[in-house]
């Protein structure tokens, strides 16, 4: 080397990782390392993991003058000493209504009837212990089973003869088999009763009330009834009041008032009769002018009362 470039051990500093260089001779140096580093130039990160305190299977990960613990899923905290509450972390840790119980290093599930497994996800096969009659099909359900019976068999275990085979229910009734004793049960349509739905229900004899309204007369029929209505009423149960004014029976601008079983016509001045069809002849032209004016006035009043809206005459 030329004398122009004399070797200076610490210029530039050979110490890395923040180490401080100290010249110890013409050609020698010493590095003073920061905590966590070692080597002649502080090039080595000291492994801080010996005597680490990571617990419960935690893995020590070396840092600079420190270390961290990489914890298994069931543990947390600086040294993996804090238990992870899986029940809080995973609300569905236990399935199908199972109750979650946190434990150190894990969790447990208390399963409801019919479920099993670590997370209550396995449906217990109830058919393994079922006693469906041979020839029937067992269907596993949650905490139970059901037997699907072949034609002619009934009952919980398909061990009974199906009483519905002989069509004992009449009038289109629905037939079911009692799963306990095999007897048939008929669900009767409206208007019929009895074990096999052959008896007519007398709707008119029912004690609670007359099914026909407005004093209509109840007439029983097979499987049903009908109502004979009083004048002025209609409908299956005489529930509707007939509006006799609907056909405009009143004449000469008269107002029709509907009444039960009839109507009343309110005549304009100068008219009379049930339908206001008769004109009253006064024979006085002067009076006629007065009546004409009165007729308009009356007409206005009645019209307003009957229809509740303005009607202008010009």
């Amino acid at each position: 080397a030329g004398s122009d470039n004399p070797y200076v051990p610490c210029a530039p500093s050979p110490c890395v990782n923040g180490g401080t260089c100290r010249q110890t001779g013409d050609f020698t140096f010493e590095c003073s390392c920061l905590p966590g580093f070692e080597g002649s130039t502080c090039e080595r990160n000291i492994d801080d993991c010996p005597n680490h305190r990571c617990q419960n299977g935690g893995v020590c990960v070396d840092g600079v003058n420190t270390y961290n613990c990489r914890c298994p899923p069931q543990w947390t905290g600086q040294f993996c000493t804090e238990d992870v509450d899986e029940c809080l972390l995973q609300p569905n840790a236990c399935q199908n209504g199972g109750t979650c119980t946190n434990r150190n290093g894990g969790y447990g599930c208390v399963c409801v009837n019919g479920w099993s497994g670590d997370d209550c996800s396995e449906n217990i096969d109830d058919c393994a212990f079922a006693s469906c009659t041979p020839g029937s099909t067992c269907i596993d359900r949650v905490a139970s089973f059901s037997c699907m019976c072949p034609e002619g068999k009934a009952g919980l275990l398909c061990h009974l003869d199906d009483a519905c085979i002989s069509n004992p229910c009449h009038k289109g009734a629905l037939c079911d088999t009692n799963p306990l004793n095999g007897h048939y049960i008929c669900t009767c349509p409206q208007g019929y009763k009895g074990a096999d739905c052959t008896e007519d229900v007398d709707e008119c004899a029912m004690t609670n009330s007359n099914p026909c309204e407005h004093a209509g007369k109840c007439v029983n029929t097979d499987g049903a009834f009908h109502c004979e209505c009083l004048k002025g009423y209609a409908g299956p149960r005489c529930e509707m009041d007939i509006n006799e004014c609907h056909s405009d029976p009143c004449q000469n601008d008269a107002t029709c008032l509907d009444k039960i079983g009839g109507f009343t016509c309110l005549c304009m001045p100068g008219f009379k009769g049930v339908h206001c069809e008769i004109e009253i002849n006064e024979g006085n032209s002067g009076l006629n002018d007065i009546f004409e004016a009165q007729k308009i006035e009356w007409h206005e009043n009645l019209y307003f009362q009957g229809h509740h809206h303005h009607h202008h005459h010009h």
Epitope: P35, D47, D48, P50, N51, R53, F79, T81
Partner: antibody
Framework: QSVEESGGRLVTPGTPLTLTCTVS????????MSWVRQAPGKGLEWIGI??????TLFYASWAKGRFTISKTSTTVDLKITSPTTEDTATYFC??????????????WGPGTLVTVSS | AQVLTQTASSVSAAVGGTVTINCQAS???????LAWYQQKPGQPPKLLMY???TLESGVSSRFKGSGSGTQFTLTISGVQCDDAATYYC?????????????FGGGTKVEIK
Amino acid sequence: QSVEESGGRLVTPGTPLTLTCTVSGFSLSSYDMSWVRQAPGKGLEWIGIIQAGSNTLFYASWAKGRFTISKTSTTVDLKITSPTTEDTATYFCARGGVIFIIGHFNLWGPGTLVTVSS
Amino acid sequence: AQVLTQTASSVSAAVGGTVTINCQASQSVVNNRLAWYQQKPGQPPKLLMYGASTLESGVSSRFKGSGSGTQFTLTISGVQCDDAATYYCQGEFLCSSGDCVAFGGGTKVEIK
């Protein structure tokens, strides 16, 4: 920051004795605490350590079964389960100097004297 | 069990002189985590040096630590009367293989 031992006294052999180390100015959740003893005219002898964070206990091989270390939020106890005359010594409580590393002890109590004699 | 051996149980030095205290470990000290303590009669030990060579805050620079692995040295230069005390080395070992901590037997320094 300070530590102070208490509970040292004259006991007869076989009578259990508990020493207490009370700390102030720092948290036991951050620092390891060790118990060290020194028999009259003898050298220092490490008994055991309770580690911060994990609360893991380590004992010297000669001390296992003879001593029990435990702690509360502000105290560290050393129970001498069945003292013998060889357990006569001054007992020191010492704080670890670096968090997470046993390393060295940079804070010591004045010590408490235990005398075991019949 | 791990053992730290301080070869000299006592040394004497003149004021202004140099004292060297050796400490040998039966097995490698973890990451050179070796400390030196000074203890005077009736007092607890006082930390001087840790990490084999790092001076504790407030301690005189006349104290110097060196060594690695199993061999460590404490050197006191420009010895003063106040340095009269017993000096202990203390090391950290792998807890999994026995004792985590061990102290040396101590070296008493007397000033002539």
